[in-house]
């Protein structure tokens, strides 16, 4: 090849200057002995190249682009060859930003998949290939002293979450967890979380059911609903509190919240509702009094209150 471009840096901060040099070898005899080297960024010709003949007979042109405002562009050096431009060499230039500090790192422990799932916000677009790595270590104390490192968790391209499998977790023991972001312009690290996976446990919600009417039980009062729930069995050994929400199916009413309810109540009579009205109900639970995450809301249960207008309004528990 007759020409070769070298650049001060192929990847720079967006808006920064970049300097490039194009050298044409002397043995390219088919060329004009004093060729004029031209520069092109993308499709645009770039003025300002300074050209000189070096002592070994090669020609060199140096150009400084004062601000690289393209996130990606090809810089080429060329010669006029007849009526056309003959490209001698080209390089890809990239411009962008170093990664911002990943923020809002949070994790939850899924006891069904046996994994700790952590997610974060990556920050503004860098315009450059940027890798994220979830890093962690085991710690006997409050993460001031680092124990065994845990294998890095690398998310799939474009994802801002990663799952640490059970074999790398120790329950009831703290872990230090942080996200490292890296690209050609730098590295940044999120603030470190220190957590016991069990303290971020997210349980499955109970399933709401209609209470089977029994011969000896009194029918629900007017404006009342009788319901029961079946807890998620694997989570039953975890102390929890739950809350119920309900709203009329028709109209624009917002959800009304009832709770806290002990998971073990298993049955509930909800009163003070509109008579002869269809309601949508959902339940969710959280590990308590120890720390945890609220479960998702359960699938909806739809029930209808009895016809007659209620005589009094109250909430009443059945244990």
């Amino acid at each position: 090849e007759c020409g070769h471009i070298s650049v001060s840096a192929p990847i720079v901060h967006l808006g920064d200057p970049i300097t490039a040099s194009c050298i044409i070898k002397q043995n390219c005899s088919h060329l004009d002995p004093e060729p004029q080297i031209l520069w092109r960024l993308g499709a645009e010709l770039q003025p300002g190249g300074r050209q000189q003949r070096l002592s070994d007979g090669t020609q060199e042109s140096i150009i400084t682009l004062p601000h690289l405002n393209h996130t990606q562009a090809f810089l080429s050096c060329a010669l006029n060859w007849g009526n056309s431009l003959q490209i001698l060499d080209q390089v890809e230039l990239r411009a962008g930003y170093p990664p911002a500090i990943p923020h809002n790192l949070s994790c939850l422990m899924n006891l069904t998949t046996s994994s700790l799932i952590c997610q974060w916000e990556p920050g503004p677009e860098t315009h450059l290939p940027t890798s994220f790595t979830l890093k962690s270590f085991k710690s006997r104390g409050n993460c001031q002293t680092q124990g065994d490192s845990i294998l890095d968790c690398v998310p799939k391209d474009g994802q801002s979450h990663c799952s640490i499998p059970r074999k790398h977790l120790l329950l009831y023991q703290n872990m230090g967890i942080w996200v490292q972001a890296e690209n050609a312009l730098g590295t940044s690290m999120s603030p470190q979380l220190c957590l016991d996976p069990m303290d971020v446990v997210k349980l499955e919600p109970p399933m709401l059911r209609t209470m089977d009417p029994s011969p000896e039980a009194a029918p629900p009062q007017a404006g009342c609903l009788q319901l029961s729930w079946e807890p998620w069995q694997p989570g039953l050994h975890i102390n929890q509190k739950c809350e119920l929400r309900h709203k009329p199916q028709r109209g624009e009413a917002s959800w009304a919240l009832v709770g806290p309810l002990p998971l073990e109540a298993l049955q509930y009579e909800l009163c003070g509702l509109l008579p002869a009205t269809a309601y949508t109900l959902q339940i969710r639970c959280i590990r308590w009094p120890l720390p945890g995450h609220w479960s998702d809301w359960s699938p909806s249960l739809e029930l209808r209150t009895t016809e007659r207008a209620p005589t009094h309004h109250h909430h009443h528990h059945h244990h």
């Epitope: 694997p234 002990p262 073990e264």
Partner: antibody, heavy 118, light 107 residues
Framework: EVQLLESGGGLVQPGGSLRLSCAAS????????MGWVRQAPGKGLEWVSS????????PYADSVKGRFTISRDNSKNTLYLQMNSLRAEDTAVYYC???????????WGQGTLVTVSS | DIQMTQSPSSLSASVGDRVTITCRAS??????LNWYQQKPGKAPKLLIY???NLQNGVPSRFSGSGSGTDFTLTISSLQPEDFATYYC?????????FGGGTKVEIK
């Protein structure tokens, strides 16, 4: 010291009744599920029953359902197993156990022997 | 109800041997599998909970693995005090079934 101490075992005739107790100390009893596990002579472990921290959930093994009743008194830090209509096959060492959040039996008592024989 | 099947029911091994005991659940139990050690005349002792978590104070030569229906307890280098009977137990359902046990004897 964290410990569980069973009592109430002994010799009883078939059809008879017995009440086992398990006194807990060294931990907040009211926060934990508790359970009973038995072991017949020369045999393996058999889960009998468990009880939730407040006493509202009480699953039983099919082999004892309707005959045994598990209960607890959180004010006394004590777990009970009322055993009625006892049979020869109920002869075993009965262990009281403290359960963890993942259903594991974290702590065991020393066991009390129940012998059902005429 | 979930049934737990342990194998082998007994094995003979020497001090220093690597020993593997398996436990199979009749249906998927995620990681809700616990392992216990019991010596003659003594109460059982929890070794491993949630399939692979070592209980405090248990030597690191004990390890657990597996998920779903198939689980393994491994003793990397058998010590004289490890000759005992080992039980698995599921805690996915609140009816906490045990496996039949594996007796580890001196060869």
């Amino acid at each position: 010291e964290v410990q569980l101490l069973e009592s109430g075992g002994g010799l009883v005739q078939p059809g008879g009744s017995l009440r086992l107790s398990c006194a807990a100390s060294g931990f907040t009893f009211s926060l934990y599920w508790m359970g009973w596990v038995r072991q017949a002579p020369g045999k393996g472990l058999e889960w009998v029953s468990s009880i939730s921290s407040s006493g509202g959930v009480t699953p039983y093994a099919d082999s004892v359902k309707g005959r045994f009743t598990i209960s607890r008194d959180n004010s006394k830090n004590t777990l009970y197993l009322q055993m009625n209509s006892l049979r020869a096959e109920d002869t075993a060492v009965y262990y009281c156990a403290k359960l963890g959040e993942l259903g594991q039996s974290m702590l065991w008592g020393q066991g009390t022997l129940v012998t059902v024989s005429s | 109800d979930i049934q737990m099947t342990q194998s082998p029911s007994s094995l003979s091994a020497s001090v220093g041997d690597r020993v593997t005991i398996t436990c199979r659940a009749s249906q998927g139990i995620s990681s809700y599998l616990n392992w216990y050690q019991q010596k003659p005349g003594k109460a059982p002792k929890l070794l491993i909970y949630y399939a692979s978590n070592l209980q405090n104070g248990v030597p690191s030569r004990f390890s657990g693995s597996g998920s779903g229906t198939d689980f393994t307890l491994t003793i990397s280098s058998l010590q004289p005090e490890d000759f005992a009977t080992y039980y698995c137990q599921q805690s996915w359902q609140i009816k906490l079934k045990f496996g039949g046990g594996t007796k580890v004897e001196i060869k």
